[in-house]
C-alpha cells in the first residue's frame, strides 16, 4: 500500500500538526513536494527540508540535535518532485532507515530562509503486521536487509 501526502502549507492537517498516518510494514509513504505550474504565489514558492525528529523536536518544530535526521529537500518548486519512504524492518547492512512495529515516527519540515513556507508536521504510526509478505525472508539481511 502507498500513502500519498501532499506536503505544502495548503494542507491544514500538516499545518495544525494533527496529521497522523498509520502504515504497515512494507507500505510506502510518498511525500509530494509543492509544485507550481506558473510563477507561484506572490509571497514566493515554498521550499524546505524535511526531517525525521524525536517527540520534543516534533512538539517544538525544531530540527536540531543528534535525533534530527534530514530526509529530503523540496527545493525545486517548478518541477515535479516526490520522495518515498519504505516502511521496512530491514535494510541491507542497515544503510537505510529501519522502522519498528508499534512505534511512532515524526516528520517536520523547516522552511529554507528564502521560503514563504511554514512549519508542517506529520506523525507516522507503524502498525504491527505486514500487509503482504514480499518473500519468506527479507532481501539482503545484515541488519539489514
Amino acid at each position: 500500500l502507498r500513502h500519498v501526502v501532499y506536503w505544502n502549507s495548503s494542507n491544514p492537517r500538516l499545518l495544525r500538526g494533527d496529521a497522523v498516518v498509520e502504515l504497515g510494514l512494507n507500505d510506502y509513504l510518498d511525500i509530494v513536494c509543492p509544485h507550481y505550474e506558473g510563477p507561484g504565489p506572490p509571497e514566493g514558492p515554498e521550499t524546505f527540508a524535511l526531517y525525521m525528529v524525536d517527540w520534543p523536536g516534533y512538539e517544538s518544530c525544531q530540527a536540531e540535535g543528534p535525533r534530527a535526521y534530514k530526509r529530503w529537500v523540496c527545493s525545486l518548486p517548478f518541477g515535479h518532485v516526490q520522495f518515498s519512504e519504505k516502511i521496512q524492518r530491514f535494510t541491507p547492512f542497515s544503510l537505510g532507515f529501519e522502522f519498528l512495529p508499534g512505534e511512532t515516527y515524526y516528520y517536520i519540515s523547516v522552511p529554507t530562509p528564502e521560503s514563504s513556507g511554514q512549519c508542517l508536521r506529520l506523525q507516522v504510526s507503524v502498525c504491527c503486521k505486514e500487509r503482504k509478505s514480499e518473500s519468506a525472508h527479507p532481501v539482503g539481511s545484515p541488519g539489514e536487509s
Epitope: 530491514f90 547492512f93 544503510l95 518473500s135 532481501v139 539489514e144
Partner: antibody, heavy 124, light 112 residues
Framework: QVQLQQPGAELVRPGASVKLSCKAS????????MHWIKQRPGQGLDWIGT????????HYNQNFKDKATLTVDKSSSTAYMQLSSLTSEDSAVYYC?????????????????WGQGTSVTVSS | DVVMTQTPLTLSVTIGQPASISCKSS???????????LNWLLQRPGQSPKRLIY???NLDSGVPDRFTGSGSGTDFTLKFSRLEAEDLGVYYC?????????FGGGTKLEIK
C-alpha cells in the same frame, strides 16, 4: 563507546549444547539488529542469522536453522546463541556483529561493530 | 545462495607497490532499491574482521584513501594504490543484496 563483549573460549563435548553470550554496551541495544557469524579455522565466514532485540524477531540462514537458536535478554543488553548437537564441524570462532546507524545528510550510514569472538572447541 | 569468488587466494606484494583483489558474484548484486550492497572487510592477524568499504566504493570512517573499491553487477575490485605494512591480513568481500548474506573465501595479503 560501542562494545560487544564475548567470552574467549568454550570447550564442549560432542552431542552437547553450548550457549554463547554477547553483552552489548555503549548504544541502545533495542534499536539495531544483532548478527552472528561463524569462522572455522583457516576458513572463510558464514552468516548464521540475526535477531532484533526490540521484539526478538529472527531470521536464520537455512544452513543453520536446526543448529542455532538466537535469543536476547533486554534487561542485561545481552544476545545469546545456543548451538545444539555439536560435532567437530561446529568447532569455530563465533562473532556477534551489529550495525549502529547514524545519519550523514539524507543518507544513513551504519558502522559495523564486532565482538572479539568466542572460540568453540568440540572435543571428547 | 549467492556464491562469492575471490582471486587470488594469496597476494604477495612489496611495501609501497600497488595491488588489487577481485571478487565475482554468481548473481548481480544490484538491489531493487538501486543500490549495490557489496562490502570489503579486512581481518588482521588475531583480530576480528572490520569493514573497510561499503556500497562498492564508499570508505568507512578512518580508512585511508589508498584503498579504492569499484565494480558493478557481478564483478568487483579492491585496489591499493601503495601497500603499507598495516595492510596485511585477510580480505573478504561480503554481499547483503540477497538473502542470506554471503562472503568470499578470502584473499591473504602478505608482505614480500
Amino acid at each position: 563507546q560501542v562494545q560487544l563483549q564475548q567470552p574467549g573460549a568454550e570447550l564442549v563435548r560432542p552431542g552437547a549444547s553450548v550457549k554463547l553470550s554477547c553483552k552489548a554496551s555503549g548504544y541502545t541495544f533495542t534499536r539495531d539488529w544483532m548478527h552472528w557469524i561463524k569462522q572455522r579455522p583457516g576458513q572463510g565466514l558464514d552468516w548464521i542469522g540475526t535477531i532484533h532485540p526490540y521484539d526478538s524477531e529472527t531470521h536464520y540462514n537455512q544452513n543453520f536453522k536446526d543448529k542455532a537458536t538466537l535469543t536476547v535478554d533486554k534487561s542485561s543488553s545481552t544476545a545469546y546463541m545456543q548451538l545444539s548437537s555439536l560435532t567437530s564441524e561446529d568447532s569455530a570462532v563465533y562473532y556477534c556483529v551489529t550495525f549502529i546507524k547514524t545519519m550523514v545528510d539524507t543518507y544513513y550510514y551504519a558502522m559495523d561493530y564486532w565482538g572479539q569472538g568466542t572460540s568453540v572447541t568440540v572435543s571428547s | 545462495d549467492v556464491v562469492m569468488t575471490q582471486t587470488p587466494l594469496t597476494l604477495s606484494v612489496t611495501i609501497g607497490q600497488p595491488a588489487s583483489i577481485s571478487c565475482k558474484s554468481s548473481q548481480s548484486l544490484l538491489h531493487s532499491d538501486g543500490k549495490t550492497y557489496l562490502n570489503w572487510l579486512l581481518q588482521r592477524p588475531g583480530q576480528s574482521p572490520k569493514r573497510l568499504i561499503y556500497l562498492v566504493s564508499n570508505l568507512d570512517s578512518g580508512v585511508p584513501d589508498r584503498f579504492t573499491g569499484s565494480g558493478s553487477g557481478t564483478d568487483f575490485t579492491l585496489k591499493f594504490s601503495r601497500l603499507e605494512a598495516e595492510d596485511l591480513g585477510v580480505y573478504y568481500c561480503w554481499q547483503g543484496t540477497h538473502f542470506p548474506q554471503t562472503f568470499g573465501g578470502g584473499t591473504k595479503l602478505e608482505i614480500k
